[in-house]
């Protein structure tokens, strides 16, 4: 492929080295005032400036108070562990004026047998052990406390739960003579919630359980259990909701069948079938009841588990998710993409769109990407003219008392947003693609042709003139 241009998307760099300032000491919660963004949409810049100056005047202006970091807390109950037996934990940044809590589940694939777990332990140990976790993490995207980066929930209490159980947040088995590794993902979530109750969560109005990739699937698997846990512990007034980003996978047929040797080559159904046994994985009770014993793996797939969930869940999913394409053995690099691959990719987009038809709250741009909500560019992507933070805000508003029973969005405030154009990056607001050598941004037509997209063939397929197709692509229609 020498001489061919290559493309690169922004984002996905390793986090910066951790900073280690001390976190502010906890104080008494203060009631926050609600901010209604609808009133200021015409002049968001001046609104942001007002918010910023208000925030600065309300805070004692010490560097310590304005510290952006989330601080590590290892679980006090050390029997709830990462794969290697080290204690699990969470990163917390309290916002004492807020009764909103955001709990974010990290992603990072999984392992499903001793061999690939051993290999993961020697390569990605931070995803299996807490031994080397930094003392602090910086919140980005939906975890940011900056209104510019997070116009949705910047003032919330932020909790980042590192993924160290390799079980798609489903496991409930401890390390023993027989088990070389513990798989306690589901128990880690329960224990974090229990500990947070003593740190202010008890006064919460809304708990949003969010996650990306394997963490997004983890949301679907655990959101009802968290709601049930809080009810049992005597906190029925806390509204539990879910936000599943890039975790809505399809158990479809691979483009090219491959043996289930390694995590990223293994067909989704094969991997989860094996994993659920190896992890002693738990699935939501109502979903489990729908499938016979041994068929619980079905509940790891969004479109099967979603109809059984009681808690409201907002689904964010790229129509052309890179992780889905990876497990389906579609690799959009190197050689020009063959016609068979294009048909497969288009069909994937169609299938995914179909599974979101009955999902009340969704945001599904026609982009080739993976994960979005903790990326700093999460505010930039739009579907039908609405950004993700705006759609989440509209979803939030649908729960306000006057709209309690309402399942339909208010006029001008949509939250079921699924792209209908058929190709990767046919949405012009997709994360930027740049030519690797020149650094120039590419438009969608350049990108698609660059990947071997045959305009003649596709135009014929769609029953239109090649020139018309090119025009459509360039305009992102």
């Amino acid at each position: 492929s020498e001489g061919r241009k290559t493309w690169r998307r922004r984002g996905q760099q390793p986090p910066p080295p951790p900073r280690t300032e001390a976190a502010p000491a906890a104080g008494q919660p203060v009631e926050s005032f609600p901010l209604d963004f609808t009133a200021v949409e015409g002049n968001m810049d001046s609104f942001m400036a007002q918010v910023k100056s208000l925030a600065q005047s309300l805070y004692p202006c010490s560097a310590q108070q304005l510290n952006e970091d989330l601080r590590l807390h290892l679980l006090l109950n050390t029997s709830v562990t990462c794969n290697d037996g080290s204690p699990a934990g969470y990163y917390l940044k309290e916002s004492r004026g807020s009764r909103r809590w955001l709990l974010f589940l990290e992603g990072g694939w999984y392992c499903f047998n001793r061999e690939n777990c051993d290999s993961r332990y020697d390569t990605m140990r931070r995803l299996m052990s807490s031994r080397d976790w930094p003392r602090t993490r910086t919140g980005t995207g939906i975890l940011s406390s900056q209104p510019e980066e997070n116009p949705y929930w910047w003032n919330a209490n932020m909790v980042f739960i590192p993924y160290c159980s390799s079980d798609v947040w489903s496991g409930a088995s401890s390390k023993s003579e027989k088990n070389e590794y513990a798989f306690m993902g589901a128990l880690i979530i329960q224990e974090v919630v229990r500990e947070l109750l003593g740190r202010g969560l008890s006064g919460a109005k809304v708990l949003l359980l969010a996650g990306s990739s394997a963490g997004g699937t983890g949301v679907l698997l655990n959101v009802d259990r968290v709601a049930e846990q809080l009810e049992k512990l005597g906190y029925p007034a806390i509204q539990v909701r879910g936000l599943a980003d890039s975790g809505w996978f399809l158990d479809n047929k691979q483009y090219r069948r491959s043996d289930c040797i390694d995590t990223i080559n293994c067909a989704p159904t094969d991997a989860i079938r094996r994993g659920i046994r190896y992890w002693s994985g738990m699935v939501p009770e109502r979903c489990q009841r729908q499938f016979k014993e041994g068929e619980e793996w079905n509940c790891f797939f969004g479109y099967k588990v979603y109809p059984t969930l009681r808690c409201p869940v907002f689904v964010v999913q790229w129509l052309f998710d890179e992780a889905q394409l990876t497990v389906d053995n579609v690799h959009l690099t190197g050689q020009p993409v063959q016609e068979g691959q294009w048909l497969y990719i288009q069909n994937l987009g169609r299938e995914l769109r179909g599974t979101l038809k009955d999902v009340q709250a969704s945001f599904a741009p026609a982009c080739l990407s993976h994960e979005i909500i903790i990326r700093s560019y999460w505010t930039d992507v739009q579907v039908k003219g609405t950004s993700l933070p705006r759609a989440l805000h509209c979803w939030d508003r649908s729960f306000h008392d006057s709209h309690k029973a309402s399942k339909t969005p208010m006029k001008g405030c949509p939250f079921h947003l699924v792209d209908s154009c058929p190709w990767p990056h046919c949405n012009p607001s997709c994360p930027t693609i740049r030519d690797q050598f020149t650094g120039q941004e590419m438009n969608v037509a350049q990108f698609l042709m660059h990947m071997g997209f045959d305009v003649q063939t596709v135009a014929q397929q769609q029953g239109m003139e090649p020139s018309k197709l090119l025009g459509m692509l360039s305009n992102g229609n």
Epitope: G108, R114, Y121, S213
Partner: antibody, heavy 119, light 111 residues
């Protein structure tokens, strides 16, 4: 000082055997997955074998599967590669390398030992 | 196995100029905010030396003129300004799964 030192290379006839060793010092050997690589004259780097930190899992390149055996002794801080049924195409510089457990990159390499298979 | 395609195979750069080496993976090598791609320098008669790990992190002791970028499947090593001692062969390597494969190498010559 963190270091890896290979030994055991030499000249051997096709079909013969050889055992390479790699002595580790300056770090907690049992914490790391270890690998063998080789590099034929004027060629690129080729991965040969891997053994996990706890010795439970081993992987081999298809080109050496069934002929080479990787092992380690964490008490003695040594890594070994037993090579049998050697072929002329196994002629190369052999390196042991430490795999960093938070990234899978090879941050420490030995200086190498030469294996020549020739009649 | 993940195939890494490195380009160009060789490169001649004037002293003080920029050298850019690319590496493309046949599958995505990024997950959870980390890109499992690394860069090494090898001089004749020496073992490889780690320069950049996890796509963009400089190994300690490596001069700041070396930098790495990229995500997903496409990665770049930049050297600027190039110095005499940078004449060597450069390899990319992924660690997303076993086996850990290397690119075929780029030989950098200083003009």
């Amino acid at each position: 000082e963190v270091q890896l030192v290979e030994s055991g290379g030499g000249l051997v006839k096709p079909g013969g055997s050889l055992k390479l060793s790699c002595a580790a010092s300056g770090f907690t050997f049992s914490d790391y997955g270890m690998h063998w690589f080789r590099q034929a004259p004027e060629k690129g780097l080729e991965w040969v074998a891997y053994i996990s930190s706890g010795s439970r899992t081993v992987y081999y390149a298809d080109t050496v599967k069934g002929r080479f055996t990787i092992s380690r002794d964490n008490a003695k801080n040594t890594l070994s590669l037993q090579m049998t049924s050697l072929r002329s195409e196994d002629t190369a510089m052999y390196y042991c390398a430490r795999k960093h457990y938070n990234g899978g990159y090879f941050d420490v390499w030995g200086t190498g030992t030469t294996v020549t298979v020739s009649s | 196995d993940i195939v890494l395609t490195q380009s160009p195979a060789s490169l001649a750069v004037s002293l003080g100029q920029r050298a850019t080496i690319s590496c493309r993976a046949s599958k995505i090598v990024s997950t959870s905010g980390y890109s499992y791609m690394h860069w090494y320098q090898q001089k004749p008669g020496q073992p490889p030396k780690l320069l950049i790990y996890l796509a963009s992190n400089l190994e300690s002791g490596v001069p700041a003129r070396f930098s790495g970028s990229g995500s997903g499947t496409d990665f770049t090593l930049n050297i600027h300004p190039v110095e005499e001692e940078d004449a060597a062969t450069y390899y990319c390597q992924h660690s997303r799964e076993l086996p850990p494969t290397f690119g075929s190498g780029t030989k950098l010559e200083i003009k």
